[in-house]
Structure formats: C-alpha cells, structure tokens
C-alpha cells in the first residue's frame, strides 16, 4: 500500500500509482474526477480532492489542478453529444452534413460533405462524420437524380405494379417512365408518368 520505497523507479500499479523521485517512493495517483490537493511524503499518501464544477480530470493522475470544461465550437462545425462531467471532457461530433477535416487527438474542425452527383450516392460509413463522402454509382435498377451529400439511390418504378406499361426505361439518373397501356407514346413526350 502506498507510499512505499522503490529503488528501480517503477511502481507495482502503473495506472494507479506514480514514482515520486524526491523521496524515491511510489505514491497513489488520484482517481478520475479528482486532483492532488496534498502531495505524498514518506509518511503520508497523496490526498485527493474532487474537481470543482466546470472542471474535470479523465484519468488516474497526479495533477494539482483539474482541466477546465470547454464547449464544442459551433464555428468549427462541431456539436455536443454529451456534457462535460468531473470525469470526462465535453464529447463533440461534426454537425449533420459535415465531416471531420482536421484531427488532433480529437476532431477540431468539420467541413461540409461533398455532393454526390446524379447517378451516385454516398457510400455508407461505419461512423457518421468521420470522412468526406465517397460517391458510388447506383446499383442496377436504381436511380438518383439530384446533386446532394445525402440523397440515396431509389429503386426504379415498376410500371406493372401500377397497372401501367413502360414508356422509357430508367437510368442511373432517372426513373422509369410509365404510360397507360391504351396510349401510344409520341416520341417527343417524356416525364415519369404519362396519363
């Protein structure tokens, strides 16, 4: 149990203890949410105190202060997903429609996702906001007719499901055009449905 002497400058529990060179002893670190209010000596272990409101320490530590809580920066495109507590900093992520463009231990700057052109859609990512859009072509039988960062390819309309016949096949950028079976289709007419 700390404090105890250590000649080789290492402690038994690296996570919860630290080496104090002045006295050549191992002392307890303070748990998350606390800081060192009195340093250890040969006869007394570290004394810890709870972080004040609006401050935190995330790890077992031998810090003499707690870190100040900071809000996520909306100017940098960040939004909050979880508040700061005495044991963790504010948790941030990119706002919807944005991705992380600058990373330094955590995301510091988000930018707008690129549009995917007609005929394509953004490849689904494991984690939202992690990277810019990678646009992939619509699979067979699907279309997407806008330039958008988030539009998804939709299945072509099946004319027969509506009691209609196909006037023009769908493409990656456009839906199938349907018409009434009784109508003959003049070549210049277009549109998704001709009635």
């Amino acid at each position: 149990v700390p404090p105890y002497g250590s000649e080789n400058q290492t402690c038994r529990d690296q996570e919860k203890e630290y080496y104090e060179p002045r006295h050549r002893i191992c002392c307890s670190r303070c748990p998350p949410g606390t800081y060192v209010s009195a340093k250890c000596s040969r006869s007394r272990d570290t004394v810890c105190a709870t972080c004040a409101e609006n401050s935190y320490n995330e790890h077992w530590n031998y810090l003499t202060i707690c870190q100040l809580c900071r809000p996520c920066d909306p100017v940098m495109g960040l939004e909050e997903i979880a508040p700061c507590t005495s044991k963790r900093k504010t948790q941030c992520r990119c706002q919807p429609g944005m991705f992380c463009a600058a990373w330094a231990l955590e995301c510091t700057h988000c930018e707008l996702l690129s549009d995917c052109p007609p005929g394509t859609e953004a490849e689904l990512k494991d984690e939202v906001g992690k990277g810019n859009n990678h646009c992939v072509p619509c699979k067979a039988g699907h279309f997407q007719n806008t330039s958008s960062p988030s539009a998804r390819c939709q299945p072509h309309t099946r004319c027969e499901d509506q009691g209609l016949v196909e006037a023009a096949p769908g493409t990656a950028q456009s839906d199938t055009t349907c018409r009434n079976p009784s109508e003959s289709l003049p070549p210049e007419m277009s549109g998704t449905m001709l009635m």
Epitope: N54, D73, A82, P83, T85
Partner: antibody, heavy 116, light 107 residues
Framework: QVQLVQSGAEVKKPGSSVKVSCKAS????????LHWVRQAPGQGLEWMGW????????QYNEKFKGRVTITADKSTSTAYMELSSLRSEDTAVYYC?????????WGQGTTVTVSS | DIQMTQSPSSLSASVGDRVTITCKAS??????VAWYQQKPGKAPKSLIS???YRYSGVPSRFSGSGSGTDFTLTISSLQPEDFATYFC?????????FGQGTKVEIK
C-alpha cells in the same frame, strides 16, 4: 448564492408563441450551461435544450427543433426560451436549470397555459 | 434516446420505513445519473448526482447506488417531509431523459 428567477405565468392562444425569461445571479453567467425543462400537468419532466451563454450557442431536443429558440443576453445575465406554434399539449410548467452533473439549481418555474 | 424506466410508479409507506426506488436505463450511462425530489407546486430539488454523490444539505438518510444501467435511490428511514415525487435523470448523453417519477405517499 446561485439564483434563477423566471418570468410570470402566461396564457396563450393555440398557434401563438410564448417567450419565458430566466434571470441568473450569484455566479458567472457566461461559463455555465442553462437548460430548459418542462412538466405538463401531472406528468414527468422533459428536457428541451440548452444555451451556453459564453458563445450564445444553443442545442435542442429533436422533439422541439424548429419550434423552440433559446437565447441569452449576457449584459443582463438572462436566458430566454421561446416556443412557437403553441398547441394545448404545450400547457406546462417551464423551468430553467443550471447544469453540472445533473441540475443542481432550478428556477421557480413559469406556468404556460395554451387555451382558445 | 435513452429511456429511464423508474419503478414503482407509486408506493405507500409509513414514517420510519426503508424505501427503495429503482431506475433502469435502456443503455449504459456509466454513473451519470441524478435523483430529484419534487413536492406539489415546487421545482425539483437535487438530491444525488454521479449515482451516489449526495448534495450538501441533503440528509444522510438519502443514498444512491448503481452504475451502467441499474440505479437505486434509498431512503433509510422515511420522515414526514419525504412524502413527495422522486425522479431519476441520465445526463450521460443528449437528449437528457428522466424517469416517469415515483410518488411516495403516506400509508
């Protein structure tokens, strides 16, 4: 000591808007989040959103997005919650609360009645 | 959103009784849970934060425990002034959510 003093009761018509104020004192207004929580008659508590007066940025519960606006005036240490397109289900007591690991400090509440 | 399921919704007890209220989160919220007491016509009053930390001025008969998804508020010996409604709340992630409340009534 920390105090949050809210504006008085309001009676509003359906479709109109209401703006409730919350004047803070006893602490540095710009360094703490102020939240709004409501409670319908005989019901539980429902979190609406917060404002961080330091940068006047607000974040909202998706349920209220587009209908609620939370603002703050640093010069008077006052936060405001405006709710628009009121309906009868918005009849409730609206509370402001200062957060730190929950809500240690609450305003006294403002009763908003929506009735035609 | 994280659901906080509180039970029981109401209970009848006598002065001196030990009362236990439970709250179950729909997903892990660590110890980021607070408990409140509310009396009719009044704002909620903070009792507990970080699942078990009792606010200064709150009598020692109130205690909180739990972590992850299961939390408990215990009143060791119910006093006349404790008859009220109690709410749990998670502040682990937005949107913050509350339990539906437990009304403690006089038997």
């Amino acid at each position: 000591q920390v105090q949050l003093v809210q504006s008085g009761a309001e009676v509003k018509k359906p479709g109109s808007s209401v703006k409730v104020s919350c004047k803070a004192s006893g602490y540095t207004f710009t360094t703490y989040y102020l939240h709004w929580v409501r409670q319908a008659p005989g019901q539980g508590l429902e979190w609406m959103g917060w404002i961080y007066p330091g940068n006047v940025h607000a974040q909202y519960n998706e349920k209220f997005k587009g209908r609620v606006t939370i603002t703050a005036d640093k010069s008077t240490s006052t936060a405001y919650m405006e709710l628009s397109s009121l309906r009868s289900e918005d009849t409730a007591v609206y509370y402001c609360a200062r957060s730190w690991e929950g809500f240690p400090y609450w305003g006294q509440g403002t009763t908003v009645t929506v009735s035609s | 959103d994280i659901q906080m399921t509180q039970s029981p919704s109401s209970l009848s007890a006598s002065v001196g009784d030990r009362v236990t209220i439970t709250c179950k989160a729909s997903q892990n919220v660590g110890i980021n849970v607070a408990w409140y007491q509310q009396k009719p016509g009044k704002a909620p009053k903070s009792l507990i934060s970080s699942a078990s930390y009792r606010y200064s001025g709150v009598p020692s008969r109130f205690s909180g425990s739990g972590s992850g998804t299961d939390f408990t508020l215990t009143i060791s010996s119910l006093q006349p002034e404790d008859f009220a409604t109690y709410f749990c709340q998670q502040y682990d992630t937005y949107p913050f959510t509350f339990g539906q409340g437990t009304k403690v009534e006089i038997k």
